[in-house]
Amino acid sequence: GSERTCCPVNWVEHERSCYWFSRSGKAWADADNYCRLEDAHLVVVTSWEEQKFVQRHIGPVNTWMGLHDQNGPWKWVDGTDYETGFKNWRPEQPDDWYGHGLGGGEDCAHFTDDGRWNDDVCQRPYRWVCETELDKASQEPPLL
């Protein structure tokens, strides 16, 4: 299989996951493809602790995460349940704003300058974060 036991070069390990932080911008779909082609996915935030970790690395810069509602309901790219999971939206968000004049609403979620989340036009070229989980099996204690 493609399970990892340690993080690739230039990735950061944290709590049994590996993270890669871009320094350029892409539309959400291209960022999604980039991560998938690294055998990873756009970052899925499952706790306040993980939120703080990512926020500390990206700084005050708009950055895509693996959350979108392009097909209706909000969904995490790895299948993590949105409704029962961690959320950190800015007040009044998500609002699916149509006033930007670019056509359609706002279907992709990103970290804003203060770390809280906003929905925005998926074509905007924001930075992004890839995440991949380390081999679950390697966490098991050895058999005696």
Epitope: S2, K26, D30, Y34, R36, L37, E38, D39
Partner: antibody, heavy 121, light 106 residues
Framework: EVQLLESGGGLVQPGGSLRLSCAAS????????MSWVRQAPGKGLEWVSV????????YYADSVKGRFTISRDNSKNTLYLQMNSLRAEDTAVYYC??????????????WGQGTTVTVSS | SYELTQPPSVSVSPGQTASIACSGD??????ASWYQQKPGQSPVLVIY???KRPSGIPERFSGSNSGNTATLTISGIQAMDEADYYC?????????FGGGTKLTVL
Amino acid sequence: EVQLLESGGGLVQPGGSLRLSCAASGFTFSSYAMSWVRQAPGKGLEWVSVISGGGSSTYYADSVKGRFTISRDNSKNTLYLQMNSLRAEDTAVYYCAKWRGNPTDYGMDVWGQGTTVTVSS
Amino acid sequence: SYELTQPPSVSVSPGQTASIACSGDNLGDKYASWYQQKPGQSPVLVIYQDSKRPSGIPERFSGSNSGNTATLTISGIQAMDEADYYCQAWDSSTVVFGGGTKLTVL
């Protein structure tokens, strides 16, 4: 020396199947995305498929989606292309190629010599 | 589907400079690569990430990309540069090639 060597091409009837292989050497195979690219006689290059280094993500051209399957065996340093329901328009030289980095940003920096697939009755 | 358009042919005299254009919607927002293919041979990457040269590619080969057009420039053209040239980019989960340009050295 970095090298890619394709095999498995040949003559097949329409509707038939063929499996192409690409043996890689001289680099850490599992670290790189790989692609198949084809070229019909007298025509330009046409991308067929790409697979991530670990094999978890695959993408296909619309013209082959549902008929072709790309896969890899990193323990054998080998890339595969399973071709089913072959059509006359699939006739081409098929190249195996290594991506220099992530395919969204980089080009293919190593190419095999190609293997010829002919679909005809 | 996304398309990359190249001129079918370009002719240039030895020692001159050849420019091959590749156009596509907002191509400047993507990374362009260029390949050289001589008759009966496999393609060779000559430019990636718009303007970078792999090791072994002469400095005579350069690239740029902005707006809707990526350009491959070959200065001091030599007979050995006669070949087909293809541009390539990634768009919407697919790899896209231009139709190719036949460069003829007069």
